[in-house]
């Protein structure tokens, strides 16, 4: 049976290992893990340093302030910027919508409201824990970079997990594994000691003793409900058949635009409809 955390413990930012407790994920505090930790201490600095505060100040760039509307993602080009638009939007800045509330564009239980002006055919009001113009993005708790020593942060929905680089271990990759020193696993694999010998836990898309062999990510047909699997630089990507969403097309989309996501699917996080 699932653990019953302290009453009121934030399901997004807190978790428990014993009944009645409420332990906070990094970046959150308070008895119920509802208070964000102040970011004024420059936890994730980027850009040139400020002489007055010691904090790093971002340099200006064409994607600053994200010129892409409606949840479009901005990428810098040699001369300017380029917007990659979500489903149903197009135009230089993703400002043109070809979708209305009748198409059920709001995911994860988002409430669709018709737009007040011609440039926005609809607006999605997202439930807590989701964001984006279509409520397609789970709030990114990895942005505070909780994984140390270059570990890869994974937001599993019910908890954060760190995938550690070779030579490091622990919930936040805080432990240095001296036994694996000089025995690195290739392609982002993690070295694990066992019986005096080292073993590699390989990153997605790789296999073999030292993770040097490229695996076929689509071999096991991971995309459910007729989803089409493509090998991708990050492992694999699923193109979901209409009516399904999630990283592996595992979640049905209801006609009203909501999806049948379990409250906290074990080991999974509800993903973008196509990826």
């Amino acid at each position: 049976a699932p653990l019953v955390c302290r009453a009121g413990c934030s399901p997004e930012h807190g978790f428990c290992e014993q009944p009645g407790e409420c332990r906070c994920l990094e970046g959150w505090t308070g008895p119920l893990c509802t208070v964000p930790v102040s970011t004024s201490s420059c936890l994730s600095p980027r850009g040139p340093s400020s002489a007055t505060t010691g904090c790093l100040v971002p340099g200006p760039g064409p994607c600053d302030g994200n010129p892409c509307a409606n949840g479009g993602s901005c990428s810098e080009t040699p001369r300017s910027f380029e917007c990659t638009c979500p489903r149903g939007f197009y135009g230089l800045r993703c400002e043109v919508s070809g979708v209305t509330c009748a198409d059920g564009p709001c995911f994860n239980g988002g409430l669709c409201v018709g737009g007040a002006d011609p440039d926005s055919a609809y607006i999605c009001h997202c439930p807590p824990g989701f964001q984006g113009s279509n409520c397609e993005k789970r709030v990114d708790r990895c942005s505070l970079q909780p994984c140390r020593n270059g570990g890869l942060c994974l937001d599993l929905g019910h908890a954060l997990r760190c995938r550690c680089r070779a030579g490091f271990a622990g919930p936040r990759c805080e432990h240095d594994l001296d036994d694996c020193a000089g025995r690195a696993c290739a392609n982002g694999g993690t070295c694990v000691e066992g019986g005096g010998a080292h073993r590699c836990s390989c990153a997605l898309g790789f296999g073999g003793r030292d993770c040097r062999e490229r695996a076929d990510p689509c071999a096991a047909r991971p995309c459910a409900h007729g989803g089409r699997c493509y090998a991708h630089f990050s492992g694999l990507v699923c193109a979901c058949a209409p009516g399904y969403m999630g990283a592996r097309c595992e979640f049905p989309v209801h006609p009203d635009g909501a999806s049948a996501l379990p409250a906290a699917p074990p080991g999974l996080r509800p993903g973008d409809p196509q990826r």
């Epitope: 489903r87 135009g91 490229r214 689509c218 047909r221 699997c229 193109a239 058949a241």
Partner: antibody, heavy 123, light 111 residues
């Protein structure tokens, strides 16, 4: 340099069979989404036939009209074949091999094509 | 599913603009899974536009795709002699299986 080359085309009699081969160079199918066949009758438009997963799953998709008479398969990490049976004069066409890639949440993007091989069905 | 292209042929002078329409009998996958190809005689097609409006690698910005759902347009501005070709739209669909269809093609004549 990434390339596709079709082979196996030629003259075949009605009700005959033929197997076309698509050979890739510069890349491996396993990292390339799907491999597909598209045909074009002389002076006519393009017609999608079938696709097969570049990986080991062997998943396939066929146009409704091609099911039964046409069969796509992957014979190695760089070759795909199209077996055609019960051929008729209407199957006379240039047959192209094309690579289908996933870009920005869209699929069936044929970003690499072979030069094509001509199949003529005639008695 | 049927993709209907109009008009064909279409002609314009060098430096001019042509617009090709592609009407789908049913909405394409994700409302934007439509591509445009250019084909010259004796050559295989070349991908110009994917995701209805995104320019493929190496394609000049004179080519512009737009539309969503069932109605799509390819606009070629500042026409050059080299743009003389046949242009095809291609839609992707799912109905108990994935499949793709091409429009009938539109020949562009540059005067």
């Amino acid at each position: 340099q990434e390339q596709l080359v079709e082979s196996g085309g030629g003259l075949v009699q009605p009700e005959g069979s033929l197997t076309l081969t698509c050979t890739a160079s510069g890349f491996s199918f396993s990292s390339s989404g799907y491999m597909c066949w598209v045909r074009q009758a002389p002076g006519k438009g393009l017609e999608w036939i079938a696709c097969i997963s570049g990986g080991s799953s062997g998943d396939t998709d066929y146009a409704n009209w091609a099911k039964g008479r046409f069969s796509i398969s992957k014979t190695s990490s760089t070759t795909v074949t199209l077996q055609m049976t019960s051929l008729t004069v209407a199957d006379t066409a240039t047959y192209f091999c094309a690579r289908d890639v996933y870009i920005d949440s869209t699929i069936f993007n044929f970003n690499l094509w072979g030069p094509g091989t001509l199949v003529t069905v005639s008695s | 599913q049927v993709l209907t292209q109009t008009p064909s042929p279409v002609s314009a002078a060098v430096g001019g603009t042509v617009t090709i329409s592609c009407q789908a009998s049913q909405s394409v996958y994700n409302n934007n899974n439509l591509a445009w190809y250019q084909q010259k005689p004796g050559q295989p097609p070349k991908l110009l536009i994917y995701a209805a409006s995104s320019l493929a690698s190496g394609v000049p910005s004179r080519f512009k795709g737009s539309g969503a759902g069932t109605q799509f347009t390819l606009t070629i501005s500042d026409l050059e002699c080299d743009d003389a070709a046949t242009y095809y739209c291609q839609g992707t669909y799912y109905s108990s299986g994935w499949y793709s269809t091409f429009g009938g093609g539109t020949e562009v004549v540059v005067k």
